[in-house]
């Protein structure tokens, strides 16, 4: 922590300007009034402060705003944002997308994924929902950031906004997030024709249940293996060999290349070997002919 000293009269600060770069840490602490700093935050980013000096300025703002900075200050943080921790950001209330854009630009190229995730979370809370303007801002300035939101936050996305989401925006989404987004996407694209629907729904299919995957297999969609591999394991396992063949179309030969990877490996283990043989791909590991499969979990549930 910066030690307290009194400010020499000749060092008194009346405005935030370039002369401050020559101040030592303790002089900044003693001579810069926190309220003045807050009022003139828009000047700070133009001044080449050292990281040590920025620490002092942050300390002053923290003292002035122990409950969290107001948006008028947050909007002009500039490189001072790089000093913020997720705990600091959690105290903020942010509603302006201009503020979000400004801070996303600053964070680019820095290891700040936790801070950015918290910032986006605060914006969604501040605005009440994940509206189209917010999604547009995220896709433009922070591809992939949508997936930093919790499933709970993502549940506030109205289906009408889903069309603004691009495949690359979902690249880092986990299964729980796709579980939330998929039903919204299904609703958003429900009036589209078969092929157009598949193109749109494809990035969301990691959240699709078995019955929807089975339905797709009846529509000649020719799903590529990359999409198939992103399907939930639980959605893939009940599919029959015939359904998978119809679902993948000409891409079915890719099963051979991916046979060691889940969910393909797990699916193979659940199929009868003679059914797998009909694909002509040399897939091995299916249930041998003549074997009976007893689902012991059912028996355990009954006992």
């Amino acid at each position: 922590d910066v030690e307290r000293t009194t400010c020499p009269p000749e060092k008194e600060v009346h405005e935030i300007d370039e002369s401050l770069i020559f101040y030592k840490k303790r002089e900044l602490e003693a001579c810069v009034d926190a309220a003045l700093l807050a009022a003139q935050m828009d000047r700070v980013d133009a001044i080449p402060f050292t990281y040590e000096q920025l620490d002092v300025l942050k300390h002053k703002l923290d003292e002035l705003y122990p409950q969290g900075y107001p948006e008028s200050v947050i909007r002009h943080l500039g490189h001072l944002f790089l000093k913020m921790s997720p705990e600091d950001i959690r105290k903020w209330n942010v509603t302006s997308l201009e503020t979000l854009k400004a801070l996303l630009k600053v964070s680019k190229g820095h290891e700040m994924s936790a801070q950015v995730a918290t910032l986006i979370d605060r914006v969604v809370v501040g605005r009440g929902q994940l509206d189209k303007d917010t999604v547009d801002t995220l896709t433009a300035f922070c591809p992939g950031c949508l997936c930093s939101l919790s499933p709970e936050r993502l549940s506030s996305v109205p289906p009408s906004v889903i069309g603004a989401v691009r495949p690359q925006d979902l690249d880092t989404c986990g299964p729980r997030q796709l579980d939330v987004l998929y039903p919204k996407a299904r609703l958003a694209f429900q009036n589209m024709s078969g092929s157009e629907y598949f193109v749109k729904i494809r990035p969301f299919l990691g959240g699709a249940p078995t019955e929807d995957v089975k339905a797709l297999s009846q529509q000649n969609v020719s799903m590529d293996l990359a999409t198939f591999m992103k399907l939930r394991r639980e959605a893939v396992l009940p599919l029959t060999v015939a359904e998978v063949q119809k679902l993948l179309g000409p891409h079915v030969e890719g099963l051979k290349v991916e046979e060691q990877h889940s969910p393909v490996r797990d699916w193979i283990l659940k199929q009868r070997q003679d059914d797998l043989d009909t694909l002509g791909l040399g897939l091995q590991g299916g249930i041998p002919n003549g074997y009976l499969i007893l689902d012991l979990s059912v028996r355990e549930a009954l006992s």
């Epitope: 495949p167 690359q168 690249d171 590529d224 293996l225 990359a226 198939f228 591999m229 992103k230 891409h251 030969e253 890719g254 099963l255 051979k256 290349v257 991916e258 046979e259 060691q260 990877h261 889940s262 791909l281 040399g282």
Partner: antibody, heavy 119, light 108 residues
């Protein structure tokens, strides 16, 4: 432009471990597996294994089982290959190469990382 | 594992000549699962041909591939100065994936 950029050359002692990174850009990271292939000085190419960045699932060439670990960081579009218990015969150039899921050919390669194992 | 044997190990030819490179597999390879790569000294390999006969993006038409079962061929119809390099065949029909030992095409 599609690019795979690998980390710099490494010099290691026998018994140590090395971790090589491969940062991808210019394409949908999770639509392609990342494979690792090595090439000893004056020798041919040897496939080590692959990772599916979407699921984190890995397949390793049995020759390297127990010594190689492949991981991914989706948020950074980066994959890593760690080789442990290094010996002099592990001296090689290590390449990452992307492979469209469902195909087996490598259409884009990293620039290679030279790993030298010497006491 | 499937062993791929390439022959000849070295091919000495002049620019303008036809080059025929062979790749023989120890057991049958599904033809969809064989590719060819070119590598120049100090550079990474580059995909030339995939699925036995499909030309990769940006590869000139003088390169062609053929074959089935255990025998595969890469042909360069008329050698250009930039074609002198090492060529590798590669199979992913059977695990683990393997490469041939390479054929070096050098200037005569």
């Amino acid at each position: 432009e599609v690019q795979l950029v690998q980390s710099g050359a490494e010099v290691k002692k026998p018994g140590a471990s090395v971790k090589v990174s491969c940062k991808a850009s210019g394409y949908t990271f999770t639509d392609y597996n990342m494979d690792w292939v090595r090439q000893a000085p004056g020798q041919g190419l040897e496939w080590m294994g692959d990772i599916n960045p979407s699921t984190g699932g890995t397949i390793y060439n049995q020759k390297f089982s127990g010594r190689v670990t492949m991981t991914e960081d989706k948020s950074a579009s980066t994959v890593y290959m760690e080789l442990s218990s290094l010996r002099s015969e592990d001296t090689a150039v290590y390449y990452c190469a992307r492979r469209r899921i469902g195909t087996g050919y490598f259409d884009v390669w990293g620039q290679g990382t030279t790993v030298t194992v010497s006491s | 594992e499937i062993v791929l044997t390439q022959s000849p190990a070295t091919l000495s030819l002049s620019p303008g000549e036809r080059a025929t490179l062979s790749c023989s597999a120890s057991s049958s390879v599904i033809s969809s699962y064989l590719s060819w790569y070119q590598q120049k000294p100090g550079s990474s390999p580059r995909l030339l041909i995939y699925r036995t006969s499909n030309l990769a993006s940006g590869i000139p038409a003088r390169f062609s591939g053929s074959g089935s079962g255990t025998d595969y061929t890469l042909t360069i119809s008329s050698l250009e100065p930039e074609d002198f390099a090492v060529y590798y065949c590669h199979q992913w029909s059977s695990f683990p994936y393997t490469f041939g030992g390479g054929t070096k095409v050098e200037i005569k």
